[in-house]
């Protein structure tokens, strides 16, 4: 039961995390204009991975995509790549983990297969989370570096080639969303890996030998009795999940909405 809960929780946490990574990647507020020295501007700038926006006090907002690849800073391209890799790995991980969930029966899939799939998805979630955290951190570092540069010829942001000295950018909401989402995906991945250990079947089937103290007339016969191992006559080493009441094979299986055959 604990294994199923851990696996399910890991899946849900990862799902939320990956949704957050996707949201962060799509958000325009990766960097926002720093208003500390200039709170009286009627024009507010903010930038994302894909476009930069200007919001005027009138409420009018204008966004422009970065329609060039070669003209963009290499670091921005790296951040984009990290976030996309994180999303792709996370999405594949989610797909794999759905079929690995203990609460879903797919034909006669062995526990060992589910354990392997759980571990695979867990590793994918961990790498996905790390990619997101790395991407956001690289971008944040780039912002900090640019913030303290006061030379007029530096890049102010991801899309701009022209710098006006008074415009400085600071951390946008997307960075915090990305960090939290990456962390959640990472935690979800770790939980999946932990669940995998509980799912993995014990490989060794211990066959105990019963030794009887016998009289002179009784000859010793090895293997005469099978020792009670707790699994009765079931030679397949199945784990008992619901408090030892029944084995999984003893539970009648009815078709349900979770059956994918």
């Amino acid at each position: 039961m604990a294994v199923t809960a851990c696996q399910g929780l890991g899946f849900v946490v990862s799902l939320i995390g990956i949704a957050g990574i996707i949201a962060a990647t799509c958000m325009d507020q990766w960097s926002t204009q720093d208003l500390y020295n200039n709170p009286v501007t009627a024009v507010f700038n903010y930038q994302g991975l894909w476009r930069s926006c200007v919001r005027e006090s009138s409420g009018f907002t204008e966004c422009r995509g970065y329609f060039t690849l070669l003209g963009l800073p290499a670091m921005l391209q790296a951040v984009r790549a990290l976030m996309i890799v994180g999303i792709v790995l996370g999405a594949i991980g989610l797909l794999v983990s759905i079929f690995a969930l203990k609460c879903i029966r797919i034909g006669s899939m062995e526990d060992s297969a589910k354990a392997n799939m759980t571990l695979t998805s867990g590793i994918m979630f961990i790498v996905s989370g790390l990619c997101a955290i790395a991407g956001v951190s690289v971008f944040a570092n780039m912002l900090v570096t640019n913030f303290w540069m006061s030379t007029a010829n530096m890049y102010t942001g991801m899309g701009g080639m022209v710098q006006t000295v008074q415009t400085r950018y600071t951390f946008g909401a997307a960075l915090f969303v990305g960090w939290v989402a990456g962390g959640l995906t990472l935690i979800g991945g770790v939980m999946m890996c932990i669940a995998c250990r509980g799912l993995a079947p014990e490989e060794t089937n211990y066959k105990a030998v019963s030794y009887h103290a016998s009289g002179h007339s009784v000859a010793y016969k090895p293997g005469g009795f099978k020792a009670s191992t707790g699994f009765g006559s079931n030679t397949k080493n199945k784990k008992i999940y619901d408090g030892g009441a029944r084995t999984e094979d003893e539970v009648q299986s009815y078709p349900s909405k979770h059956d994918y055959v």
């Epitope: 200039n38 009286v40 009627a42 006090s57 009138s58 409420g59 422009r64 942001g157 008074q166």
Partner: antibody, heavy 118, light 113 residues
Amino acid sequence: QVQLVESGGGVVQPGRSLRLSCAASGFTLTSYGVYWVRQAPGKGLEWVAVVWAGGNTNYADSVKGRFTISKDNSKSTLYLQMNSLRAEDTAVYYCARDRGRLLAMDYWGQGTLVTVSS
Amino acid sequence: DIVMTQSPDSLAVSLGERATINCKSSQSLLNSGNQKNYLAWYQQKPGQPPKLLIYGASTRESGVPDRFTGSGSGTDFTLTISSLQAEDVAVYYCQNDHFFPFTFGQGTKVEIK
């Protein structure tokens, strides 16, 4: 068509209060920002205050704390509550609409004269 | 506050001649985010409210004759009347639309020589 009509001007003693109104038609105050701009006799234009479509406001330093800009969206009316009036507040007060993009005043009222004198 | 300084204070030009008014701001009105200059030009004739001529430093308001041209970027801007007409006699103001308060220049009076 867009129209702005100011009212409420007159002669007032220093230290007293006055409320100006600006009736807007041809557009909604929920979609556009509206400004108050004043012009002292024989002088240039001075920006006074603005209320944006969303309700945010900004003021010139010279009137901050004394003047309050507000609007009634349902009545399509803009207000300028002027307290602690001074002689230097004597001017023609215009209300003007913001054009929405690149922040310029595209429509102006005819103005209302406020005279602060003892 | 941003200080807007216009030059000259007054200008006398013959009909059909070019009139040029300059405006200098104490801080750049160019926004790096969209590469737009937040500066407007207004015309005010005696006894009338101001009229918007140019916004965004160079975009002509609809209905404004094409003899009026706005140019410049950053801190230096120019309003040019390519061929002065009798109806162009007025006071012209530039205005900062980027930073609060939205300050105006002191005005330039254009007359016919």
